[in-house]
């Protein structure tokens, strides 16, 4: 058993049928010595008396808010949560496996640049009685500071019969140098509590590996005289790290017909313009990627040919 | 990525082309190592990220773009003395800092070159003959060093008398390649920045 926060405790259980559970001793936070009784949640049934209460915690029915009273007055509370260990592996019931980029990915994180600011998000089908708290650091043995905000519900989607909820959090490394070569990964830890179930999820990454630039901005077409060709031009996104000559991007320009089956023409360039043939009803799209370190491509910025 | 290879203009900053080749070569070598050594801990998540140049060179700090020198977090630089007469500086008014930057890059390359050559000698003794260093990568390191053209003491290749532990050597190769790729990215960024300056 360990303390999650004041008066909230997590009991770790080896979770299998007929498991013996864990013996837990609760102590009433009071100078009083006698006349103390204990109850669980809203029930008025007295579980025991005395300054301490010993319970055998086996299942969720044994978890909840234990309260010690004296003469009708509440003295203190202890909330017991359960953390299930199923065959040596901590349970992951609360969050959905996003399966991207690999199986067992519960937290996904992205950064728009090298400033040390990043966003993480996760998915759940649970809509109520759910709380999250997020901590982060650079490295784990001698952790350096990363400050995270509160996790917020950022999107709701309908997936088949289920509703899916997306939560996200923004974090900022306290003293980040965009040009630094990372040798210690960022660690992100999310505590999730659903009713009386506790779970924790972690992710470890280097900012350089989670970079995903915003799409190029100001995408424009300039027709070339007496030609089906057009000059496409664009600019670095505002959110990208500066100077651009140091934090350079490379670009992919794509000409896509109306039908998804039509052949796509693609050109790769380090410049912020390209000359392409504009077909009728086609659209031109451009996306960006760090020129020197192949992390994710940005989403496409698009303009119609017409 | 199948990107068209840019060929430098004659007037272009001479080292940019070499640094691009370097990054391409080390990235290819790392990819090959990860595929060949699939049963070894060779991914970014599994290895310890060690920097053999730590406390010996200060490339990131010495090569910091002017725009980032206002960022306090970037200015924890160490004092290191370097030789300052490089041909990449040819016909350019260069500050002392730029000379320091390029000589720091040169020292990095020299240290990695020695490590890679020592390691290759060990790998050649492996009866499994599982992996060797790409000669192209070693040649590209050499070319960039020549382009930088700093006079510096030659570092003797480390020779080892004891029987090599091939498992450890291969893990060390992965660690070295990951670190060198990160340094090659920095070198490429620096060359691109200097070329634009």
């Amino acid at each position: 058993i360990w303390e999650l926060k004041k008066d909230v405790y997590v009991v770790e259980l080896d979770w299998y049928p007929d498991a013996p559970g864990e013996m837990v001793v609760l102590t009433c936070d009071t100078p009083e010595e006698d006349g103390i009784t204990w109850t669980l949640d809203q029930s008025s049934e007295v579980l025991g008396s005395g300054k301490t209460l010993t319970i055998q915690v086996k299942e969720f029915g044994d978890a909840g808010q234990y309260t010690c009273h004296k003469g009708g007055e509440v003295l203190s509370h202890s909330l017991l949560l359960l953390h299930k260990k199923e065959d040596g592996i901590w349970s992951t019931d609360i969050l959905k496996d996003q399966k991207e980029p690999k199986n067992k990915t519960f937290l996904r994180c992205e950064a728009k640049n090298y400033s040390g600011r990043f966003t993480c998000w996760w998915l759940t089908t649970i809509s109520t009685d759910l709380t999250f708290s997020v901590k982060s650091s650079r490295g784990s043995s001698d952790p350096q500071g990363v400050t995270c905000g509160a996790a917020t519900l950022s999107a709701e989607r309908v997936r088949g019969d289920n509703k899916e909820y997306e939560y996200s959090v923004e974090c900022q490394e306290d003293s980040a140098c965009p040009a630094a070569e990372e040798s210690l990964p960022i660690e992100v830890m999310v505590d999730a509590v659903h009713k009386l179930k506790y779970e924790n999820y972690t992710s470890s990454f280097f900012i350089r590996d989670i970079i995903k630039p915003d799409p190029p901005k100001n995408l424009q077409l300039k027709p070339l005289k007496n030609s089906r060709q057009v000059e496409v031009s664009w600019e670095y996104p505002d959110t990208w790290s500066t100077p651009h000559s140091y934090f350079s991007l490379t670009f992919c320009v794509q000409v896509q017909g109306k039908s998804k089956r039509e052949k796509k023409d693609r050109v790769f360039t380090d410049k912020t313009s390209a000359t392409v043939i504009c077909r009728k009803n086609a659209s031109i799209s451009v996306r960006a990627q760090d020129r020197y370190y192949s992390s994710s491509w940005s989403e496409w910025a698009s303009v119609p040919c017409s | 990525r199948n990107l068209p290879v840019a060929t430098p203009d004659p007037g272009m900053f001479p080292c940019l082309h070499h640094s691009q080749n370097l990054l391409r070569a080390v990235s290819n070598m790392l990819q090959k190592a990860r595929q060949t050594l699939e049963f070894y801990p060779c991914t970014s998540e599994e290895i310890d990220h060690e920097d053999i140049t730590k406390d010996k060179t200060s490339t990131v700090e010495a090569c910091l773009p002017l725009e980032l020198t206002k960022n306090e977090s970037c200015l924890n630089s160490r004092e290191t003395s370097f030789i300052t007469n490089g041909s990449c500086l040819a016909s350019r008014k260069t500050s002392f800092m730029m000379a320091l930057c390029l000589s720091s890059i040169y020292e990095d390359l020299k240290m990695y070159q020695v490590e890679f050559k020592t390691m290759n000698a060990k790998l050649l003794m492996d009866p499994k003959r599982q992996i060797f260093l790409d000669q192209n990568m070693l040649a590209v390191i050499d070319e960039l060093m020549q382009a930088l053209n700093f006079n510096s003491e030659t570092v003797p290749q480390k020779s080892s008398l004891e029987e090599p532990d091939f498992y450890k050597t291969k893990i060390k190769l992965c660690i070295l390649l990951h670190a060198f790729r990160i340094r090659a990215v920095t070198i490429d960024r620096v060359m691109s920045y200097l070329n634009a300056s």
Partner: antibody, heavy 115, light 112 residues
Framework: QVQLVQSGGGVVQPGRSLRLSCAAS????????MHWVRQAPGKGLEWVAF????????YYADSVKGRFTISRDNSKNTLYLQMKSLRAEDTAVYYC????????WGQGTMVTVSS | SYVLTQPPSVSGTPGQRVTISCSGG????????VKWYQQLPGTAPKLLIY???QRPSGVPDRFSGSKSGTSASLAITGVQAEDEADYYC????????????FGTGTKVTVLG
């Protein structure tokens, strides 16, 4: 004590269907994940499928994906394996088992796919 | 499609020490715990070892398990006639959990 009693096995022709049941008692069935494991005659153990305690997630071996469906009825304390498009290579003893560091197995039920 | 490899058979005389190996990889045994089962002919498997080296109550102490890196082993010190059975190791893979990964199985024969 924990008990898992299996039923539903038998002889079936290739291409036909069969449903296996596993009745649980002696524990809070709705709190635990459950597996199906099979063993072809003279062969080793092969995992078939898993279902979460609440039925929200199901996982299958590639060899049965799209043909077998694992399900549970927590009000009846019963686990099921619906097997469709059966093949000769599905011939095996099928076991249900609880998920956890200490597990409990059903007695096994024989499924024979033969024309 | 077995990822955990065991020797097909091992044998020993009563009282001898018999060991069975179970070889896996970094993504299974390397980062998950190992179980060992004993299966007597015509019966369901019986749990002998969980959590690499833990014995459930009721399992004789002549059975012991260990794990090192990407391999695990089961030792029977002072093997007895009633130990003649098939033995299976089991673990999980990091990417496919909760799918059970079973070993290929080992037939233990007690001679004499």
């Amino acid at each position: 004590q924990v008990q898992l009693v299996q039923s539903g096995g038998g002889v079936v022709q290739p291409g036909r269907s069969l449903r296996l049941s596993c009745a649980a008692s002696g524990f809070t069935f709705s709190s635990y994940g459950m597996h199906w494991v099979r063993q072809a005659p003279g062969k080793g153990l092969e995992w078939v499928a898993f279902i979460r305690y609440d039925g929200s997630n199901k996982y299958y071996a590639d060899s049965v994906k799209g043909r077998f469906t694992i399900s549970r009825d927590n009000s009846k304390n019963t686990l099921y394996l619906q097997m469709k498009s059966l093949r000769a290579e599905d011939t095996a003893v099928y076991y249900c088992k609880t998920h956890g560091s200490h597990d409990n197995w059903g007695q096994g039920t024989m499924v024979t796919v033969s024309s | 499609s077995y990822v955990l490899t065991q020797p097909p058979s091992v044998s020993g005389t009563p009282g001898q020490r018999v060991t069975i190996s179970c070889s896996g990889g970094r993504s299974n045994i390397g980062c998950n715990t190992v179980k060992w089962y004993q299966q007597l002919p015509g019966t369901a498997p019986k749990l002998l070892i969980y959590g690499n080296d833990q014995r459930p109550s009721g399992v004789p102490d002549r059975f012991s398990g260990s794990k090192s890196g990407t391999s695990a082993s089961l030792a029977i010190t002072g093997v007895q006639a009633e130990d003649e059975a098939d033995y299976y190791c089991q673990s999980y893979d990091r990417g496919t959990h909760p799918a059970l990964l079973f070993g290929t199985g080992t037939k233990v024969t007690v001679l004499g």
